[in-house]
Interface confidence: low
Amino acid sequence: LPKAPVITTPLETVDALVEEVATFMCAVESYPQPEISWTRNKILIKLFDTRYSIRENGQLLTILSVEDSDDGIYCCTANNGVGGAVESCGALQVKMKPKITRPPINVKIIEGLKAVLPCTTMGNPKPSVSWIKGDSPLRENSRIAVLESGSLRIHNVQKEDAGQYRCVAKNSLGTAYSKVVKLEVEVFARILRAPESHNVTFGSFVTLHCTATGIPVPTITWIENGNAVSSGSIQESVKDRVIDSRLQLFITKPGLYTCIATNKHGEKFSTAKAAATISIAEWSKPQKDNKGYCAQYRGEVCNAVLAKDALVFLNTSYADPEEAQELLVHTAWNELKVVSPVCRPAAEALLCNHIFQECSPGVVPTPIPICREYCLAVKELFCAKEWLVMEEKTHRGLYRSEMHLLSVPECSKLPSMHWDPTACARLPHLDYNKENLKTFPPMTSSKPSVDIPNLPSSSSSSFSVSPTYSMT
């Protein structure tokens, strides 16, 4: 008798590994014999598709070599014209051992930046990714994180982060390891020990020391008054990523000596500079040599301080006056990084106007010194504490800064703006009045040696500082 089809063995979920065989069984009882068709995700599987084998009158579907794209719902449908068609469905879950699809690569990174080592994986179940540094599992912390993708992100890279890394992808079917990659951390050149300034007698020998570090180890070059050192001998030694350079000089004239440490990061260079002055005790150059010329300021350090297009005096006792004076200011400004926010802008204005003095053009270009009142205002109001410390260090022979040797004028020797208003230069950036001074906490035990008047503010001022208003 004719009998409608009945599926006696419903399809079940099949787990299969990639490249292995997977079989679905769809046992059917019926008369006459049914026609059995198969679908994957509701799309008909064609009988002639060579990736499949359909046997046992269609009751057996075999996937000959499973691919990860084969996962889905497989259904068999049986129909013999008696009654309705019957269907049974089951899922194929493609299991896959972990595979690293984008392995990490060697990375060179500058200290302080962010490094990312890629590690993209595939597998089913989804692999968990961990990292090994050297021989130990890598611990995550506030800087170091394994991202969702498996990549390793290191914020604010430190020297200690350098080393060999590999990622590990793991699931229930197995483990995959990436090749070992190297994270190299490069560090900008930095001066550990700056050369010290010296005041020596004519004909002395002086050795200037400069120590620097960085990764790769920097090279050190010496500059004398803006030019490469022409005389003197240089000795160098390198130990534990620290380079020590010693420049021995026979002193016949004063000079500004700059140690420049440089290292290379890819196509870019990083540079650190430190300068020292060599002055000669009782050195007095003949007046005819002590000349200079007027020129517009073209440097960077004093841009915000000097009036726009200011004419400044460039001292030709330096081989390259612009470079030498700029270096002097640069070095002095570095000293100012540690002073109070009240003192710093005032001291910067004083330094810039003292080293790049206003220039009076004429047959003989003449530098115009700062007015005494402004100098005293900086010394005894804005920077009283700092000045006291500096003078104390000077007396004890501890102070080796450009700020002392070249960059700070002796206020009492400067002309007063009350004597001849054209004989001295005013600092437009020190704009304060008596009201401010009244509220300003006393910083000195002694009174100013000159009354500080209401100083006129200048229209060219690019910022103003009052002792009661901190600027950083």
Partner: antibody, heavy 118, light 112 residues
Framework: QVQLQESGPGLVKPSETLSLTCTVS????????WTWIRQPAGKGLEWIGR???????DYNPSLKSRVTMSVDTSKNQFSLKLSSVTAADTAVYYC????????????WGQGTMVTVSS | DIVMTQSPLSLPVTPGEPASISCRSS???????????LDWYLQKPGQSPQLLIY???NRASGVPDRFSGSGSGTDFTLKISRVEAEDVGIYYC?????????FGQGTKLEIK
């Protein structure tokens, strides 16, 4: 300053393959992900995929079966191929640099319009 | 895929007035490292998109400080403190947490 420039045919026939190239100038192609993003007229942005300079790729699953990306570091170029195109693939195609320091597309090309039509 | 939803889709603003655009993600964009993987882009008329804000709240270089990004997890906001005529265009949020990166449908800012 790094600049990106897309190039390729503006008209592609249905069922054919769309091919675009992005040229990186003013900087190195190394150490970045390079991305393709498209925008059908009057619609939003769709991320197509990205390629790293080593050649490894990530594609949008919705386009994965049709997308191929490649990179030629010697020419500072990367390319997109999209096969079996239909009218739905008509869009402005942008190449962009994915800066993984900022996790963002920081530099974009000006875009090239591709029309799929017979 | 992570679905990004922006509101409003259209935003008429008077110059000088503030503006605010909301973006919501279908799952949290806050990673355990503390960063929110959400970027904001502006596409001015006839131009390609340009980056405004990355990692939720960091202004890209050259972006005026009237633009600010805030929010965490699934809810984010782009604020313009004082809208200028040059700010018109379509603003998109984008999640950078997962592949595929997905964008919001865009908010069209126009001047009243």
């Amino acid at each position: 300053q790094v600049q990106l420039q897309e190039s390729g045919p503006g008209l592609v026939k249905p069922s054919e393959t769309l091919s675009l190239t992005c040229t990186v100038s003013g900087g190195s192609i190394s150490s970045y992900y390079w991305t393709w993003i498209r925008q059908p007229a009057g619609k939003g942005l769709e991320w197509i995929g990205r390629i790293y300079t080593s050649g490894s790729t990530d594609y949008n699953p919705s386009l994965k079966s049709r997308v191929t990306m490649s990179v030629d570091t010697s020419k500072n170029q990367f390319s997109l191929k999209l096969s079996s195109v239909t009218a739905a693939d008509t869009a402005v195609y942008y190449c962009a640099r994915y800066n993984w320091n900022d996790d963002a597309f920081d530099i974009w090309g000006q875009g090239t319009m591709v029309t799929v039509s017979s | 895929d992570i679905v990004m939803t922006q509101s409003p889709l259209s935003l008429p603003v008077t110059p000088g007035e503030p503006a605010s655009i909301s973006c919501r993600s279908s799952q949290s964009l806050l990673h355990r490292n503390g960063y929110n993987y959400l970027d904001w882009y502006l596409q001015k008329p006839g131009q390609s998109p340009q980056l405004l804000i990355y990692l939720g709240s960091n202004r890209a270089s050259g972006v005026p400080d009237r633009f600010s990004g805030s929010g965490s997890g699934t809810d984010f906001t782009l604020k313009i403190s004082r809208v200028e005529a040059e700010d018109v265009g379509i603003y998109y949020c984008m999640q950078a947490l997962q592949i595929p990166h997905t964008f919001g449908q865009g908010t069209k800012l126009e001047i009243k």
